[in-house]
């Protein structure tokens, strides 16, 4: 019968050839009476036979991310009476797996949004690489995360690729973080190779600050003709936030002589305060009230940066008209 | 017996093209490497070029690559060895020499008498 | 690409003497490695190929040892056909490399 053990060469040897071990018949008794033949594809091309031992030989490079396994076949014949010794028989030639495909980020490019001021341990995004060598080969597949940049707000996951928020982070401070994540196979020993790639993160804008006004005090003037309804004037509060968490309403606080009004401008985010009752310079030639000014939505466990609204001191003098 | 026999050689000038034959004869020719080496007047031997028995795998030496180009016509047992480009340094008498079995798969166990190759203007 | 170093150049020896030459890899190249004969006007011929198997039809007074770097030729006693240059290649890696050649002449 056939004598061998199971066929096994490396990828990527840079020798001319590459012995790979030997097919026999144990009726060979080493005399050179019989001739072995091989069979298949990558016969002559990829592997040879010495026709007069049996021994195997890879004649060329071969790589085991573009085939990892051989199947050919074996003859040996009499070369007195041209005959087979043995039938003919099928054997496999693996090729084993040597570290020489880094890591590759496939879903390039990695952007995530995530709300400012997010816990600690809250998850951002998973990023994932792939490696071409063979997960089953010691550990040429395994890889480890690490964050090359991104510290300290961040961290991944070493074996997962998860990335996490490890610090809290203010919108109105920065908006987004480039973070760099690197994939090392070999699960980071000797000899490993690696991989990276660049996840943007972007911050999303939470209801954290309040509106504010730009003055603590406004002069405005209002004519004693005027009619009930008119727009004496504007004031503006800024407010950090972006969006619906910068919408605001403005209101009275304090008017004794209940004259005035503050309506809300909701397109350019300005207060405009209306005359409510008509004036009379003879009577009262000046006012003096206060405002505040609230944001319009403020989810519940945002209200302790809302806690005392943001107020001003509006002036207000009477212009006298001549009265006939 | 094996034998070798290798022609096409030639005085040329620089730049110019060349084509070496080698045939052979008293083996099975497809079941084995071929190589070129050449010698150039006075000095040692120097490997140029290798072509697999199916002529699927070939090799070059740095000094030839992009240059020449090695083939094989199995149904006529020859080997050939494509020049161009020729330099003044290629000037050598060229042998082919037939491979090994096994392990010597890529050696060089038969050599020819040799074409001498003169590159002169 | 691996540099073969021939040591001595030339040898001057007489008929019947014992012949070692050297061969030195500039890295391992296991036990690949030929030795080779050339007369004068003459194609090289196969010695030794393995480090120290002999090819066909060549004389036991032919041996060759070694493995890794260093290699030896030794001809036990010199006979009037083997004044010649005799050379050593490597045929493990590529490119194929010939060491510069050693002489070995009539004292």
């Known amino acids: 019968g056939w004598v061998w053990n199971q066929f096994f060469v490396p990828e990527e040897m840079n020798t001319t050839s590459h012995h790979i071990g030997q097919l026999r018949s144990d009726l060979d008794n080493g005399n050179n009476s019989f001739q072995y033949k091989l069979l298949g594809a990558g016969a002559g091309s990829t592997f040879i036979i010495d026709e007069r031992t049996g021994d195997i030989y890879a004649i060329q490079k071969l790589d085991r991310e573009e085939r990892s396994l051989y199947i050919l076949r074996a003859q040996v014949i009499d070369i007195a009476t041209g005959r087979a010794v043995e039938p003919e028989s099928e054997f496999v030639i693996k090729v084993s797996d040597i570290n020489d495909n880094e890591p590759k980020f496939l879903d390039e490019p990695y952007e995530a949004i995530v709300p400012e001021m997010s816990p600690e341990g809250t998850l951002v995004i998973q990023v994932t690489a792939s490696d071409a060598d063979d997960p089953s080969s010691g550990n040429n597949a395994r890889l480890l995360y690490s964050l090359l940049q991104g510290q300290p707000y961040f961290s991944v996951e070493p074996t997962t690729g998860v990335i996490r928020i490890s610090s809290k982070m203010d919108r109105e401070l920065q908006d987004e973080y480039w973070v760099i994540i690197q994939a090392k196979d070999m699960i980071g020993q000797p000899g490993a190779l690696s991989g990276t790639t660049s996840v943007l993160i972007k911050l999303s804008d939470v209801n954290d600050n309040k509106p504010i006004f730009k003055e603590s005090l406004y002069r405005l003037t209002v004519s004693e003709s005027a009619p009930t309804g008119t727009s004496i004037g504007t004031i503006m509060a800024y407010d950090n936030d972006i969006g619906e968490n910068a919408e605001m309403d403005y209101s009275i606080e304090e008017d004794d002589s209940q004259t005035f009004d503050i309506i809300t401008n909701h397109e350019t985010q300005e207060g405009i305060v209306i005359l409510k009752k008509k004036v009379d310079f003879e009577h009262q030639n000046h006012y003096g009230i206060r405002a505040k000014v609230k944001n319009h939505h403020v989810p519940e466990q945002l209200m302790k940066y809302h806690t005392e609204a943001s107020t001003t001191f509006i002036k207000i003098q009477v212009e006298d008209v001549d009265e006939p | 017996q094996v034998q070798l026999l290798e022609s096409g050689g030639g005085l040329v000038q620089p730049g110019g093209s060349l084509r070496l034959s080698c045939a052979a004869s008293g083996f099975t020719f497809s079941s084995y490497a071929m190589n070129w080496v050449r010698q150039a007047p006075g000095k040692g031997l120097e490997w140029v070029s290798t072509?697999?028995?199916?002529?699927?795998?070939?090799y070059y030496a740095e000094s030839v690559k992009g240059r020449f180009t090695i083939s094989r016509d199995n149904s006529k047992s020859t080997l050939y060895l494509q020049m161009n480009s020729l330099r003044a340094e290629d000037t050598a008498v060229y042998h082919c020499?037939?491979?090994?079995?096994?392990?010597?798969?890529?050696?060089?166990?038969?050599w020819g008498q040799g074409t001498l190759v003169t590159v002169s203007s | 690409e691996i540099v073969m170093t021939q040591s001595p150049v030339t040898l001057s020896l007489s008929l019947g003497e014992r012949a070692t030459l050297s061969c030195r890899a500039s890295q391992s190249i296991s036990s690949n490695l030929a030795w080779f004969q050339q007369k004068p006007g003459q194609a090289p011929r196969l010695l030794i190929y393995?480090?120290?198997t002999r090819a066909t039809g060549i004389p036991a007074r032919f041996s060759g040892s070694g493995s890794g770097t260093e290699f030896t030729l030794t001809i036990s006693s010199l006979e009037p056909e083997d004044f010649a240059v005799y050379y050593c290649q490597q045929y493990n890696y590529w490119p194929l490399t010939f060491g510069g050649g050693t002489k070995v002449e009539i004292k």
């Open positions: 072509i697999s028995g199916g002529g699927a795998n070939t």
């Open positions: 393995g480090a120290f």
């Open positions: 020499a037939k491979g090994g079995m096994g392990g010597y798969y890529y050696g060089m166990d038969v």
